[in-house]
């Protein structure tokens, strides 16, 4: 089953996908599409790359903000709406017989959560949890965990009814390794 990523309406969603070019710099075509990966290509393509660069994008909201030339083809969807919810396919079209890497990831877009305390704290939180909120400017690899954060009691409405999170610092650290398992 797909790994779920959750973003708030109006924020940016980050859907991870990567490969290791072999040899380095030897890029392969990648497509991102809405809908599970079919037997070839992607359905409802939103972005496509070739051996050199992004060469097809259906909207200016879709970006590859990672190091594309090192194989980071994670998709950023800017300013998400509820209509962006659904399964997305990242297909890496690797040379060879039946070698394509296919990754299905599920984006769930929710209405803005009621968060206490400051929004900046919520922003770090949402960047760090794969089955929680994944909005923000940067992907999980770039998320910085502050050296010390107070324990907080955070309530997020519209998300599993109510989610109580304590000892935020440890939670963030623990989740950092798992978010990339798309």
């Amino acid at each position: 089953s797909e790994v779920e990523y959750i973003a708030e309406v109006g924020q940016n969603a980050y859907l991870p996908c990567s490969y290791t070019p072999a040899p380095p710099g030897n890029l392969v075509p990648v497509c991102w599409g809405k809908g599970a990966c079919p037997v070839f290509d992607c359905s409802n393509v939103v972005l496509r790359t070739d051996n050199r660069d992004v060469n097809d994008r259906t909207s200016g909201r879709y970006w590859l903000k990672g190091d594309f030339h090192k194989g980071d083809v994670s998709l950023t969807i800017e300013n998400v709406t509820l209509a962006d919810s659904g399964v997305y396919c990242c297909r890496i079209q690797i040379p060879g017989i039946m070698n394509d890497e296919k990754h299905n990831v599920k984006l769930v877009v929710i209405k803005p959560a009621k968060v206490t305390p400051a929004p900046t704290l919520q922003r770090d939180l949402t960047s760090a949890f794969p089955r929680m909120l994944t909005t923000g400017e940067h992907g999980p690899a770039e998320t910085q965990t502050p050296g010390s954060l107070p324990d907080v009691n955070l309530t997020v409405s519209n998300f599993f009814c109510e989610l109580q999170i304590f000892t935020l610092t440890n939670e963030l650290r623990d989740s950092g390794a798992t978010i990339r398992t798309a």
Partner: antibody, heavy 120, light 107 residues
Framework: QVQLQESGPGLVKPSQTLSLTCTVS??????????WSWIRQHPGKGLEWIGY???????YYNPSLKSRVTISVDTSKNQFYLKLSSVTAADTAVYYC????????????WGQGTLVTVSS | EIVLTQSPATLSLSPGERATLSCRAS??????LAWYQQKPGQAPRLLIY???NRATGIPARFSGSGSGTDFTLTISSLEPEDFAVYYC?????????FGQGTKVEIK
């Protein structure tokens, strides 16, 4: 507009290798957005997808034929190829090369097909 | 592999009539179903892809619907050139498979 033309022997002996060439004109085989495919149709029957090759070198074969089939490409000649080894009478069919265009609105281009008969 | 079953095997209609062709998959193919038209001595031609999208250059009288396991191709008003064999094809799971075809013939 992309045009495709199959060529190759119309008669192959059992146990030999069937070899077909598809020549592409009106488009580059090395450009993205096209899946270069082989499909066959047994006489009076339905269609069977043999496999495809993408410009990246990504290749997919029908598992029922995988051990016997090879699809390759020569970008300098703008051609792609089908080889099917150890043929039997069951491989007698019309063989089509086709290109499925997937950028924008999907479309397709087909050769006219070539009948290959396997017989001694 | 996924088996596609088309019905009816033959459909006898007159020009101007509405044709409704059915395709049922042995397991869900989501919306990854295409329809092809084939005339005698010719290669197939893609009509509909992803269940309901018309391919390049296909007239509006052809429409597709359905998802999961049950799909329909509708030709709203048959033209003389529409009498042919129609195949459904799935691209949800490898290998892509075709139905056995429905022949639309002149009544």
């Amino acid at each position: 507009q992309v045009q495709l033309q199959e060529s190759g022997p119309g008669l192959v002996k059992p146990s030999q290798t069937l070899s077909l060439t598809c020549t592409v004109s009106g488009g580059s085989i090395s450009s993205g957005g096209y899946y270069w495919s082989w499909i066959r149709q047994h006489p009076g029957k339905g269609l069977e997808w043999i496999g495809y090759i993408y410009y990246s070198g990504s290749i997919y074969y029908n598992p029922s034929l995988k051990s016997r089939v090879t699809i390759s490409v020569d970008t300098s000649k703008n051609q792609f190829y089908l080889k099917l080894s150890s043929v039997t009478a069951a491989d007698t069919a019309v063989y089509y090369c086709a290109s499925l265009m997937v950028w924008g609105v999907m479309g397709d281009y087909w050769g006219q097909g070539t009948l290959v008969t396997v017989s001694s | 592999e996924i088996v596609l079953t088309q019905s009816p095997a033959t459909l006898s209609l007159s020009p101007g009539e509405r044709a409704t062709l059915s395709c049922r998959a042995s397991q869900s193919v989501s919306s990854y179903l295409a329809w092809y038209q084939q005339k005698p001595g010719q290669a197939p031609r893609l009509l509909i892809y992803d269940a309901s999208n018309r391919a390049t250059g296909i007239p509006a009288r052809f429409s597709g619907s359905g998802s999961g396991t049950d799909f329909t191709l509708t030709i709203s008003s048959l033209e003389p050139e529409d009498f042919a064999v129609y195949y459904c094809q799935q691209r949800s799971d490898w290998p892509p498979t075709f139905g056995q075809g429905t022949k639309v013939e002149i009544k």
